[in-house]
Amino acid sequence: QNCSGPCRCPDEPAPRCPAGVSLVLDGCGCCRVCAKQLGELCTERDPCDPHKGLFCDFGSPANRKIGVCTAKDGAPCIFGGTVYRSGESFQSSCKYQCTCLDGAVGCMPLCSMDVRLPSPDCPFPRRVKLPGKCCEEWVCDEPKDQTVVGPALAAYRLEDTFGPDPTMIRANCLVQTTEWSACSKTCGMGISTRVTNDNASCRLEKQSRLCMVRPCEADLEENIKKGKKCIRTPKISKPIKFELSGCTSMKTYRAKFCGVCTDGRCCTPHRTTTLPVEFKCPDGEVMKKNMMFIKTCACHYNCPGDNDIFESLYYRKMYGDMA
């Protein structure tokens, strides 16, 4: 991807960019491309939107191939129509404590975040808002059709759920880490971010990791068993190599992905871990990137894009990262 060779652009004409996205020259000054936006993957050839004060943060010098579009130090955040200064903490609602850092918002839930799966004593759990209370609570609905309960019970099991780490105090530092944000892509390779001060200087910093909730090419609905409405964590038949901007993971992974439902529910990562993955690029360069690996998924009706910004935020978090 070096810029010393002659400029040659794709055969098709310059792309039409979505509203609000700048058409810019790539990092070599060669071709017109749609600028990458905050939190998106960027490269020398795929630059970030300069009109929004974004730059491509490559992280450690060893990884100068692929970065994440990041706001310049001190960039404010716009959240729910309000502008917050970098470093400012605010309670976006009674449910969330948020922090703005260089254009990115990280939020910590103030309510419990467990995802409750059916169990023998509560086969139909449902979250409800109780009068006078901020946080929703779980209630157990009676089944509409008693006959369903009997034979199906053997399949129920309690799922371990992990909330945020309890607040830690270390050497005069109140350690706080927001949950990982939802993956920026519903399929294919995306980015997940969080804000933490869990470092030697107790300074807030943004962390990012690659994530893949499911491959785009997988036709998961075909795998749903007859009579079922969901496939929560489909089995991937063979180990796969991850691809990232033309670079390929050096190892193969038997990764877990989240499935799909046919009844309007969405399946999202429930428990995850973060592991380093080494990618080898066509020019022989090797780069190491942190990546989310799914342990379990949960299927629920609180799907991203619901009307309540906080509800969709709440359920689009990755709970219980073990890293």
């Epitope: 060779g5 071709c31 017109r32």
Partner: antibody
Framework: EVQLVESGGGLVQPGGSLRLSCAAS????????MAWVRQAPGKGLEWVAN????????DLLASLKSRFTISRDNAKNSVYLQMNSLRAEDTAVYYC????????????WGAGTTVTVSS | DIVMTQTPLSLSVSLGDQASISCKSS???????????LEWYLQKPGQSPQLLIY???SRASGVPDRFSGSGSGTDFTLKISRVEAEDLGVYYC?????????FGQGTKLEIK
């Protein structure tokens, strides 16, 4: 009709300067790279320089970099070649050409302007 | 620099016959994006050059189908299946994959 018209050529003494101009018409000028190619008398073609859509990137023949500069003015649909410290070996017909920047290079050529460097 | 060597330097062909011009590059001319930017230009007497073939084998718009390009790596060929009177002139191959961009020395096509 797509057209490129060069001007600014002429007789100049060694060490002198010339500025060649190329006026483009019949196409959206800012959607194309532009280039200069020269041809010495009785000789073959030689690429001189090209310039990207907005003039932020220019590439020149290494041996000419210190003396020649390519630039463009999209408002005037024009591309320029500033030639300084001219030498006898710079004597040639200078062609302005449109560079598609995609599949092909020089899909439209001007008629050329003659530069003669002689004392 | 990549040297483009054309053979023959001159060619005399009867009308209706086939003509073939070879162009060899001193090294591979595959661009870093994977494409090979090998082009052929014709300069008719007293005129500016005109594009015939780009990316080894793609015909430029308005170019008759009797012109065809082929080749890969370092060896490329321009063929004119049935030479017509208007085809006379000097043919140049050109590589645009590496700096400096370079032309072959030219092949003069004459009609017998």
């Amino acid at each position: 009709e797509v057209q490129l018209v060069e001007s600014g050529g002429g007789l100049v003494q060694p060490g002198g300067s010339l500025r060649l101009s190329c006026a483009a018409s019949g196409f959206t000028f800012s959607d194309y790279y532009m280039a200069w190619v020269r041809q010495a008398p009785g000789k073959g073609l030689e690429w001189v320089a090209n310039i990207n859509y907005e003039g932020s990137r220019t590439d020149l023949l290494a041996s000419l970099k210190s003396r020649f500069t390519i630039s463009r003015d999209n408002a005037k649909n024009s591309v320029y070649l500033q030639m300084n410290s001219l030498r006898a070996e710079d004597t040639a017909v200078y062609y302005c050409a449109r560079d598609t920047s995609r599949g092909s290079y020089f899909d439209v050529w001007g008629a050329g302007t003659t530069v003669t460097v002689s004392s | 620099d990549i040297v483009m060597t054309q053979t023959p330097l001159s060619l005399s062909v009867s009308l209706g016959d086939q003509a073939s011009i070879s162009c060899k590059s001193s090294q591979s001319i595959v661009h870093y994006n994977g494409n090979t930017y090998l082009e052929w230009y014709l300069q008719k007497p007293g005129q500016s050059p005109q594009l015939l073939i780009y990316k080894v084998s793609s015909r430029a718009s308005g170019v008759p189908d009797r012109f065809s390009g082929s080749g890969s790596g370092t060896d490329f060929t321009l063929k004119i299946s049935r030479v017509e009177a208007e085809d006379l002139g000097v043919y140049y191959c050109f590589q645009g994959s590496h700096f400096p961009l370079t032309f072959g020395q030219g092949t003069k096509l004459e009609i017998k």
